[in-house]
Interface confidence: medium
């Protein structure tokens, strides 16, 4: 009997044994499925939020062709609209300026000595940027960059003058510290009679022969409405 | 149809005053500058100067500043250049030019008159 | 004053040359010239803007490159109503110079 119950208990033993074993396997198995499904799981996060980050950009993208669009339906819209009216007034900017404030600013991408920059100008019927504000200035700059450029400021007859009759005494300055300075050391010839913006934006008196970009800037005249989209 | 319509041929005595007018069509006559060129007889072409009809803004080739005035009347969309103090060089074909409107970026003379025959001979 | 130096100020061709009139400037004017053609008789008709830039109508046998001092007219194959005189002329502010002129004959 000693040796039934024996033999029972190495069956049960077995049975255990092969049990624990094909448990383990199957842990074992669920544990392997369980990563494969984790990495799998991890692996289309990231999908999804490379598709998200991708259609976010996308829809900014969008938003931006879809402003430029505007703004360009709105510009072309006014071009038409000023050749079908008579003409003689200035109600939308040309093409390739850009608006600010019922102005019109081109920005140079060459470089012209001070007096060929104020005729370029005025053979746009503009005149070189003339600065009236803190904010004015900073809109110049944001699109200049860190870049020497004229703009509408002289002194070659005496004082310092704006091209368009702006006063300069009572007006909006942004000189660098000791500028303008009417420096004769750069052996050019002469002082410096004409003004620019530095690479920080301040202002500084130059010669006026330095080919650097400038700024034209025409103004909208002043009745005008924006015209309705087409 | 975009067109420049010039005044007729026109004979004068050294001393003299020519004034030769040029009839824009066709498009917004405010919109865009009017030059005159100027060719004489088996030369090439001279630029002489340049209107804004829109603000009356005006440019001329050192050459003939203080002889020459360029003038526009808006209410007839007609350019005007008058030649003072005429002598024999100044004989030759005188044109007018619309300069096409390509704002901040290269200019070009895209419409032109017939041209204006001014003779001077005493 | 922007001075123009513009070769040849004469050339005789045939019918399917291909041809080059180049105008050389004093200083850079970037991209601001233009190129006519003038008929005896008649008013200069613009063939390029902007140095390489084709006007409305015209044939596609012209072209302009160059920017700079630099610049060039070709025609590819000449055709007969191509005899004229052809011009450049900068825009790099007033005065807006011509350039001599080029008359093409026929050989």
């Known amino acids: 009997q000693n040796s039934q119950l024996q033999e029972e208990l190495r069956g049960l033993r077995e049975t255990f044994s092969n049990f624990t074993a094909s448990t383990e396997a199957q842990v074992k198995g669920l544990s392997t499925q369980g990563g494969n499904v984790g990495r799998k799981m991890k692996s289309l996060e990231s999908q999804l939020e490379k598709q998200q980050k991708d259609l976010s950009e996308d829809h900014s993208s969008l938003l931006l062709h879809v402003k430029q669009f505007v703004s360009d339906l709105r510009s072309l819209s006014c071009q038409m609209a000023a050749l079908q009216g008579n003409g003689s007034e200035r109600t939308c900017c040309p093409v390739n300026w850009v608006e600010h404030e019922r102005s019109c600013y081109w920005f140079s991408r060459s470089g012209k000595a001070w007096a060929d920059a104020d005729n370029y100008c005025r053979l746009e019927d503009a005149h070189l940027v003339v600065v009236t504000s803190w904010e004015e200035q900073k809109f110049v700059q944001h699109h200049i960059g860190p870049v020497n450029t004229w703009m509408g400021l002289h002194d070659q007859n005496g004082p310092w003058k704006w091209v368009d009759g702006t006063d300069y005494e009572t007006g909006f300055k942004n000189w660098r510290p000791e500028q303008p300075d009417d420096w004769y050391g750069h052996g050019l010839g002469g002082g410096e009679d004409c003004a620019h913006f530095t690479d920080d934006g301040r202002w500084n008196d130059d010669v006026c022969q330095r080919p650097y970009r400038w700024v034209c800037e025409t103004e909208l005249d002043k009745a005008s409405q924006e015209p309705p989209l087409l | 149809e975009v067109q420049l319509v010039q005044s007729g041929a026109e004979v004068k005595k050294p001393g003299s005053s020519v004034k030769v007018s040029c009839k824009a069509s066709?498009?917004?006559?405010?919109?865009?500058?009017i030059n005159w060129v100027r060719q004489a007889p088996g030369q090439g072409l001279e630029w002489m100067g340049e209107?804004?009809?829109?603000?009356?803004?005006?440019f001329y080739a050192q050459k003939f500043q203080g002889r020459v005035t360029i003038t526009a009347d808006k209410s007839t969309s007609t350019a005007y250049m008058e030649l003072s103090s005429l002598r024999s060089e100044d004989t030759a074909v005188y044109y007018c030019?619309?300069?096409?409107?390509?704002?901040?970026?290269?200019?070009?003379?895209?419409?032109w008159g017939q041209g204006t025959t001014v003779t001077v001979s005493s | 004053d922007i001075q123009m130096t513009q070769s040849p100020s004469s050339l005789s061709a045939s019918v399917g040359d291909r041809v080059t009139i180049t105008c050389r400037i004093s200083?850079?004017?970037?991209?601001?010239l233009a190129w006519y053609q003038q008929k005896p008789g008649k008013a200069p008709k613009l063939l390029i803007y902007?140095?390489?830039n084709l006007a409305e109508g015209v044939p596609s046998r012209f072209s302009g490159s160059g920017s700079g001092t630099d610049f060039t007219l070709t025609i590819s194959s000449l055709q007969p109503e191509d005899f004229a005189t052809y011009y450049c002329?900068?825009?790099?502010?007033?005065?807006?110079?011509f350039g001599q002129g080029t008359k093409l004959e026929i050989k």
């Open positions: 200083e850079n004017i970037y991209s601001n």
């Open positions: 902007a140095a390489i």
């Open positions: 066709g498009y917004t006559f405010t919109a865009y500058g």
């Open positions: 209107i804004f009809p829109r603000s009356d803004s005006t």
């Open positions: 002329q900068h825009f790099w502010g007033t005065p807006f110079t």
């Open positions: 030019a619309r300069k096409g409107r390509e704002y901040g970026t290269s200019h070009y003379f895209d419409y």
